[in-house]
Amino acid sequence: QSFQVNPPESEVAVAMGTSLQITCSMSCDEGVARVHWRGLDTSLGSVQTLPGSSILSVRGMLSDTGTPVCVGSCGSRSFQHSVKILVYAFPDQLVVSPEFLVPGQDQVVSCTAHNIWPADPNSLSFALLLGEQRLEGAQALEPEQEEEIQEAEGTPLFRMTQRWRLPSLGTPAPPALHCQVTMQLPKLVLTHRKEIPVLQSQTSPKPPNTTSAEPYILTSSSTAEAVSTGLNITTLPSAPPYPKLSPRTLSSEGPCRPKIHQDLEAGWELLCEASCGPGVTVRWTLAPGDLATYHKREAGAQAWLSVLPPGPMVEGWFQCRQDPGGEVTNLYVPGQVTPNSSS
């Protein structure tokens, strides 16, 4: 006689919403083996029994969690195999706060994983990374766990939040930190990661404040090149004047990225240009407020963005994306900035 269970593991993790079939079969020299599943909750999957085999179909609902046992008998001999089924939920739904970090400020970073199950601190771990290493000197504050508000009843998913106080990020500041969340399940380790970009000052190491009108460029990779050229700005009297922005390369290596600069002949119009290679296109993917309210012109390797009606550019983040490759460059335009009409 042979008794087989497929998959053969004694613990099986099933993603919520996905189905899994566990087949238990037995061959019998004398006649047909009797095979059945027992220890089933009424809601735990459905069973299809055939001569010599039984198939348990798990639907990937939280109620499917349990330990069914397959029992096979042939004459006077019997075998059994238990399978611990764990249904989990771990979508790629990380939210970080703040959206970007300012060097030189004592700040708290939070990372929230949404719609999680099981909500067990032993299964879920958070890490704040600089590159591939844990950020030294970060202080973990107390974790928080809250039940998500669900549209349908009977699905108690949770959100878990970890906060850290940051150490000094040093000079020059790194381009980004990452929040990494890992779920450790039987024979399965899942990881999601979310970037927390760090503002890179163009002209001064000081963090921005309410009176500063200094633009900041943000890059999404440590090997990024982010350049803003020709953006001539004047500030209101309350803020000190800043020099004309000059290109600033964060790293000489890595993928070439689009460049953002002001179209000097068009007043407050931003131009995004592909920085390398034929067949590359660029498009605007982010602007303060609703991108649809801006006037856009896209022509292959160039894309323009202007305010409707014509006026000063709105304060906030502008992002341009280059394809193929998906490289992005972000430009932060601060408040209290007006176009320099003399330029």
């Epitope: 202080q139 504050l141 106080r165 000094s168």
Partner: antibody, heavy 119, light 107 residues
Framework: EVQLLESGGGLVQPGGSLRLSCAAS????????MHWVRQAPGKGLEWVSY????????NYADSVKGRFTISRDNSKNTLYLQMNSLRAEDTAVYYC????????????WGKGTTVTVSS | DIQMTQSPSSLSASVGDRVTITCRAS??????LAWYQQKPGKAPKLLIY???SLQSGVPSRFSGSGSGTDFTLTISSLQPEDFATYYC?????????FGQGTKVEIK
């Protein structure tokens, strides 16, 4: 000179309340996270609570959660600890302490104020 | 919570002796450790931060070492004013926790 000075301690009956204060001077109070740490007679140090510089983040030791409330008034450079439902095991010297940005050690401590909970 | 275990709980030493106090964390805390000195009736005083950095104004006979889970405070040549209780503290994660203390007494 950087200084922290606690006040408000005293004798209180079990179930009673007290409000401790900590007056800060010599530094930019609002830039620092502040803590309360206590020490029962003849025992070691026990962290009680913290509050961030702006007051937006607070946390408590499990032993005092739901009974103690930390707060601060940055315009008065003062830290507070409201202690309700006091128990005999809360009897201790209470210290306020400042923690340093980026390092998180407690680099400045007050002299302490004594709280005695007894009937 | 991270447990901090100090040893010994007390020790007797003479002026001029080299004294070593150890502190062990129940899990890795990197270098997020401080050492404090406390004299009877007084508030604790910061001696060492970040496991091995000497706090400003603290005599150089005090030194700290270690990272991860095992840490050491060393007083290279014990002075009369060093007789006190010493505490380690981890601040890697909340709740921050202290060791139970090591009392250094005169032999």
């Amino acid at each position: 000179e950087v200084q922290l000075l606690e006040s408000g301690g005293g004798l209180v009956q079990p179930g009673g309340s007290l409000r401790l204060s900590c007056a800060a001077s010599g530094f930019t109070f609002s830039s620092y996270w502040m803590h309360w740490v206590r020490q029962a007679p003849g025992k070691g140090l026990e962290w009680v609570s913290y509050i961030s510089g702006s007051g937006g983040y607070t946390n408590y030791a499990d032993s005092v959660k739901g009974r103690f409330t930390i707060s601060r008034d940055n315009s008065k450079n003062t830290l507070y600890l409201q202690m309700n439902s006091l128990r005999a095991e809360d009897t201790a010297v209470y210290y306020c302490a400042r923690d340093r940005p980026y390092y998180y050690d407690l680099d400045v401590w007050g002299k302490g104020t004594t709280v005695t909970v007894s009937s | 919570d991270i447990q901090m275990t100090q040893s010994p709980s007390s020790l007797s030493a003479s002026v001029g002796d080299r004294v070593t106090i150890t502190c062990r964390a129940s899990q890795s805390i990197s270098s997020s450790l401080a050492w404090y000195q406390q004299k009877p009736g007084k508030a604790p005083k910061l001696l060492i931060y970040a496991a091995s950095s000497l706090q400003s104004g603290v005599p150089s006979r005090f030194s700290g070492s270690g990272s991860g889970t095992d840490f050491t405070l060393t007083i290279s040549s014990l002075q009369p004013e060093d007789f006190a209780t010493y505490y380690c503290q981890q601040y890697k994660s909340y709740p921050v926790t202290f060791g139970q203390g090591t009392k250094v007494e005169i032999k």
